[in-house]
């Protein structure tokens, strides 16, 4: 080994070197949290970049760059270091117009902590392993969600556009003429029935067990879907999102009530099956796989 490489190895294996990098990362994180950093922090930023560059140079000199088996770029953790340094120099010396997007990559510096703390490295390793093991469960989950999304699409397509529309129109007004002139929320409230405090028109349906309109209103299918158009079963993608929402139980009872009011209470069966299979079974299956992966990693 050349003297330079021997010195680099000595520095690399020294505990003080790890401590220096650790303190640098933590200090860097503190500086990144500053709202309006003073001018002198620019020089501190250069110092941090310099230390990171020195760290990488030491590693490259000690282990080699990329040719051998245990060289710098063969370790995925060093990829992070490399990216951090490249972006540090890019944002500083290359004029790329809107740099704010690139500045976001400075946050990656915080992730360097993982490679420095051994315990954290193990946990993250376990997490990555669990993600690899999750692939089969994920395929099963996506498949189940897709099947139920297709069923939802067939059962409820367009149903959430059903609204209670005012019967007593002016003599020259028609549904179409009104829809062409409606602009503001206030206009909508003139012609559609809204429950107090609701941001969407009252949903209704055409089956006997679906929601009925109050006196003076009739059920029509017109306009957009509830929640600014985001809640619907009108396309496969929207239906898939709705099913994902059921699986994760993200305000699912609202979706349940909306759909049952528009389609009919019989469709409660659909929701019972989805909640049992998707929310109770699949979610716990995912958790079980993650737990198994952590157990394996610990052993």
């Amino acid at each position: 080994f050349s003297p330079l490489r021997r010195i680099s190895i000595k520095i690399l294996v020294h505990s003080l070197f790890s401590m220096l990098i650790m303190c640098t990362i933590l200090t860097n994180c503190i500086f990144m949290t500053m709202n309006n950093p003073p001018d002198w922090t620019k020089n501190v930023e250069y110092t941090f970049t310099g230390i990171y560059t020195f760290e990488s140079l030491v590693k490259i000199l000690a282990r080699g760059f990329c040719v051998g088996e245990f060289t710098f770029l063969r370790d995925p953790w060093n990829w992070l270091d490399f990216v951090v340094i490249v972006f540090a120099y890019l944002t500083e010396f290359v004029n790329l117009g809107n740099v704010s997007a690139l500045r976001t990559f400075r946050v990656l510096r915080a992730l360097k902590t993982i490679s420095v703390i051994p315990g954290l490295k193990t946990i993250v390793g376990a997490l990555i392993q669990s993600v690899k093991k999750l692939s089969d469960v994920m395929i099963l989950t996506v498949f189940c969600l897709s099947v139920f999304a297709l069923i939802g699409l067939q059962l409820f397509m367009g149903n959430l556009k059903h609204k209670c529309f005012r019967n007593s129109l002016e003599n020259n007004e028609t549904l179409e003429s009104i829809m062409n002139t409606l602009e503001s929320e206030e206009d909508f409230r003139k012609y559609f029935y809204y429950l107090e405090g609701s941001k969407d028109a009252l949903l209704c349906g055409f089956s006997t067990d679906s929601g009925q309109c109050p006196e003076g209103y009739t059920c029509v299918k017109i306009g957009r879907n509830p929640d600014y158009g985001y809640t619907s079963f009108d396309t496969f993608s929207w239906a898939f999102l709705a099913l994902f929402r059921l699986m994760t139980q993200d305000y699912w009872e609202n979706l349940y009530q909306q759909t049952l009011r528009a389609a009919g209470k019989t469709y409660m069966i659909f929701f019972v099956v989805v909640i049992f299979l998707g929310s109770f079974y699949l979610i716990n299956l995912i958790l079980a796989v993650v737990a198994m992966a952590y157990e394996e990693q610990n052993q």
Epitope: T174, E176, G216, T218
Partner: nanobody, 124 residues
Framework: EVQLVESGGGVVQPGGSLRLSCAAS????????MRWHRQGAGKQREFVAR???????DYADSVKGRFTISRDNAKNTVYLQMNSLRPEDTALYYC??????????????????WGQGTLVTVSS
């Protein structure tokens, strides 16, 4: 496709009566309001009467007390009973309805539908 067909028009003497009917056909799920309009020769179309799905009625001032609108929800039909007819009632009578129906492969559509019209002539 939804169709509205009017019938019952004809020639009648002043003071006489006529009963117009308008039947909606198609895969109808719900009919909201149903309205009668008329258009005399060289005149603009004017509203005559309206009935909602909960049977609330409304009439033009010129026909109040003489005309009666009613509907049969089971048959998807609206009727206009016209009594004490006057020469100025001579017009082509149109039926209009707000219909929600199952169309094109089972998808639901709401819209305003019109009939072709039936001619009423009041003349001595």
């Amino acid at each position: 496709e939804v169709q509205l067909v009017e019938s019952g028009g004809g020639v009648v003497q002043p003071g006489g009566s006529l009963r117009l009917s308008c039947a909606a056909s198609g895969r109808i799920l719900r009919i909201g309001y149903m309205r009668w309009h008329r258009q005399g020769a060289g005149k603009q179309r004017e509203f005559v009467a309206r009935i909602t799905d909960d049977s609330a009625t409304d009439y033009a001032d010129s026909v109040k007390g003489r005309f009666t609108i009613s509907r049969d929800n089971a048959k998807n039909t609206v009727y206009l009973q016209m009594n004490s007819l006057r020469p100025e009632d001579t017009a082509l009578y149109y039926c209009e309805a707000l219909v929600t129906a199952s169309v094109r492969g089972g998808s639901i559509h709401s819209g305003t539908y019109w009939g072709q019209g039936t001619l009423v002539t009041v003349s001595s």
